[in-house]
Interface confidence: medium
């Protein structure tokens, strides 16, 4: 059979290097050789390219080599296939030489902010040393943060003639390191080059950009001074690199702006004792560049009631993220603010918050929580400058089996009764929520039976037991990653009770 | 810029063959086919080759077919044209050219020095 | 091979002068010619190439005209510097070919 007809030509110009024609071969049964046929030089020029690769792969491809290889030029491309039973021929394609080159990435050489000019990076390279004298070039930026996975782009063109190989990039985040690459494409080719090698450029540093505020209220003391813990960070959205000096701090009671105190410090806390009434706290961060805007926090008074309007919060585990998820009745309400911190017996020093807007539900990824350690979450809602009540749940980001099981006591031993009892485990032991504990007993030499019961209860009495007997018990407590069992405790049944 | 600095003068005898060398600098040697060309003297011009140094492909002059052999070392960005069986008629200055423009393929843009060959009993 | 014939094969002139060599391919080759100025003891340097297209640096009173198989290689003012030997080349196709020369000497 005549071999199948060449379809679905394709041709690239790799500059200055060679012309590359590629084409669908179709199912061949017996050996088929292919020629590409070429006029060039606008027409006056033809010439042939045969393939001579045994492999079908390597068969559906030819190429043509310098110096038969101009720009600007038309080309027309046709592809004979030919095996013992005959030729046939492919459609004839046409090509436009400048429409299908394709140049080697340029190199980025430096990436520099401009002295005084913010949020602003240059970008110098090279020209691909092999590029068409004749054409102009455009290119595609893309640029991302260090610590971003996503990418920006540009594109723009720049003139043969133009000397300067720069491209000014604005509209940065300051203080901030970019991630730079750069591809270019002969102006009118649909073919890109790769892109160039990645450079890192950083934007010059500002003013802090802002701060977010918050605080812990302690109960008041015997003085009625009421102790207050003052949180600040770098506003979301601030350079990661973003550098503070120092900051400045001033507060007063709400009453009288007369009585305003300052203070200075370094740290990232500020313990302040306030009298009973309402406050203002106030404060800046500064760095040699000057200061960020003003963050405020009112303080309620002692007696003050807080609102409430959330009805109920729960959390569950989606996707690696922990996911915290409210009901409000307070529709004016789109601001909350959530604490979270573990929960563990002693004081808890790391305390961790975050502000939420326009939303009912908060994620954390799960890495940016110890596994298997309970956290207490809470949700304030924040209406202008009043703080509400807040709801406070637990949840663990991951849920481990516990490390150990029920401590296990028999308690009034009968004839045919007997009081299990156990302990909590304790909360470092427990690696998720337990969910219910399962009582295994067995008589000795008989079957075994078990039987559940929820988290709340700490003790369960089993009936119908057998006289005399020698029984084995143990308590196993489960979270929804699995359960442990606690050390088994023999007993023996009563042969007789005084009640009889 | 675009610099082809070839080898000093060669003095040959009948029979003998010469290698000329031409180290290319200021471009990418890889775009663009080495040319050879000879000038015997107060003579014109006669083209021998080139060679395409991305592939190694090769065009000869058929007058100097089986004499002459052009090669390329890409990590050096040397070209290199040996001619064998030398007679006295080959006596001329050796120059290797660079193939030029975009839209002018077989236009020799940038030229060696020369390498003066002798050929002499 | 496509021979190429230049004449004259010499000529004089002054500073000044407009000067017109030709150059005749043995049989068509569209626009491709390639014109060389050479200067003795000194490697040529291309002038104009595809007929008409001036090489990076010439000065304009150099230029190149024709197509098919005559073309024309003009000095529209000759000056000090130009007295050299000129050389017409095909680059159609290979082997490439030379003309003779026109050696163009102070009258």
């Known amino acids: 059979a005549l071999p199948a007809k060449p379809e679905n030509i394709s041709c690239v110009y790799y500059y200055r290097k060679n012309l590359t024609c590629t084409w669908s071969p179709g199912k061949e049964t017996s050996y088929t050789q292919y020629t590409v046929k070429r006029t060039y030089a606008f027409g006056e020029k033809h010439d042939n390219c045969t393939t001579n690769s045994s492999t079908s792969e390597n068969r559906a491809s030819c190429s043509f080599f310098l110096p038969r290889i101009t720009i600007p030029d038309n080309y027309t491309i046709e592809v004979e296939a030919e095996n013992g039973d005959g030729v046939i021929k492919s459609h004839m394609t046409y090509w436009r030489l400048e429409n299908i080159a394709k140049t080697e990435p340029p190199k980025i050489f430096r990436v520099k902010p401009v002295l005084g000019i913010k949020r602003m990076i240059q970008i110098e390279w090279i020209k691909p040393e092999l590029a068409p004298v004749s054409s102009d070039l455009k290119y595609t930026l893309r640029f991302r943060t260090v610590n971003s996975t996503s990418w920006m782009e540009v594109n723009f063109a720049k003139n043969r003639k133009d000397k300067n190989q720069t491209y000014n990039l604005t509209g940065l985040q300051p203080f901030t390191e970019y991630v730079i690459a750069l591809r270019c494409a002969v102006k009118e080719s649909k073919f890109w080059s790769d892109w160039s090698q990645e450079k890192m450029g950083m934007t010059e540093e500002e003013a802090p950009c802002g701060l977010e505020l918050w605080r812990v209220l302690k109960p008041a003391e015997a003085d009625g001074r009421r102790p207050v813990r003052l949180l600040w960070k770098k506003a979301r959205g601030a350079p990661v690199l973003e550098k503070t000096l120092g900051y400045n701090i001033w507060y007063y009671p709400e009453s009288n702006t007369n009585l305003t105190e300052t203070m200075n410090t370094t740290n990232q806390q500020l313990e302040l004792h306030l009298g009973g009434e309402s406050f203002w706290v106030s404060m800046i961060s500064y760095n040699s560049l000057g200061k960020s805007p003003v963050a405020t926090l009112r303080i309620p008074a002692i007696q003050e009631k807080s609102f409430q309007c959330i009805e109920v919060m729960q959390a569950c585990v989606a996707e690696d993220q922990l996911v915290v998820k409210w009901q409000s009745s307070a529709l004016d309400v789109n601001t909350w603010m959530i604490e979270w911190f573990p929960d563990v017996d002693s004081e808890p020093t790391t305390l961790s918050w975050e502000s939420v807007s326009q939303a009912t539900n908060w994620t954390i990824q799960q890495d940016k929580l110890k596994p298997f350690w309970c956290y207490n979450i809470s949700v304030y809602p924040m209406l202008h400058d009043k703080v509400g009540e807040p709801y406070s749940i637990q949840a663990y980001a991951k849920e481990g089996v516990p490390s150990e099981g029920p401590e296990t006591k028999v308690e009034n031993i009968g004839v045919k009764t007997v009081t299990i009892t156990w302990k909590e485990i304790p909360k470092s032991e427990r690696k998720g929520i337990i969910c219910n504990y399962t009582i295994f007993y067995q008589a000795e030499g008989g079957k075994g039976f078990s039987k559940t019961v929820n988290s709340s209860i700490l003790q369960y009495g089993l009936e119908s037991l057998k006289r005399k007997t020698s029984y084995i018990v143990q308590v196993m407590a489960s979270t929804s990653a699995g359960g442990t069992n606690g050390t088994s405790i023999n007993f023996k049944t009563l042969s007789f009770s005084v009640f009889e | 810029q675009v610099q082809l600095v070839q080898s000093g003068a060669e003095v040959k005898k009948p029979g003998a063959s010469v290698k000329v060398s031409c180290k290319a600098s200021?471009?990418?040697?890889?775009?663009?086919?080495m040319n050879w060309v000879r000038q015997a003297p107060g003579q014109g011009l006669e083209w021998m080759g080139l060679?395409?140094?991305?592939?190694?492909?090769?065009d000869y002059n058929p007058q100097f077919q089986g004499r002459v052999t052009i090669t390329a070392d890409k990590s050096t960005s040397t070209a290199y044209m040996e001619l064998s069986s030398l007679r006295s008629e080959d006596t001329a200055v050796y120059y290797c050219?660079?193939?030029?423009?975009?839209?002018?393929?077989?236009?020799?843009?940038?030229w060696g020095q020369g390498t003066l060959v002798t050929v002499s009993s | 091979d496509i021979q190429m014939t230049q004449s004259p094969s010499s000529l004089s002139a002054s500073v000044g002068d407009r000067v017109t060599i030709t150059c005749q391919a043995s049989?068509?080759?569209?626009?491709?010619v390639a014109w060389y100025q050479q200067k003795p003891g000194k490697a040529p340097k291309l002038l104009i190439y595809?007929?008409?297209t001036e090489a990076q640096g010439v000065p304009s009173r150099f230029s190149g005209s024709g197509s098919g198989t005559d073309f024309t290689l003009t000095i529209s003012s000759l000056q000090p510097e130009d007295f050299a030997t000129y050389y017409c080349?095909?680059?159609?196709?290979?082997?490439?070919?030379f003309g003779g020369g026109t050696k163009v000497e102070i009258k």
């Open positions: 080349q095909h680059h159609y196709d290979s082997p490439l070919t």
């Open positions: 060679i395409n140094p991305y592939n190694g492909g090769t």
């Open positions: 595809n007929a008409q």
């Open positions: 200021g471009y990418t040697f890889t775009g663009y086919a």
């Open positions: 050219a660079r193939d030029g423009y975009d839209d002018g393929p077989y236009t020799l843009e940038t």
């Open positions: 049989e068509d080759i569209y626009s491709f």
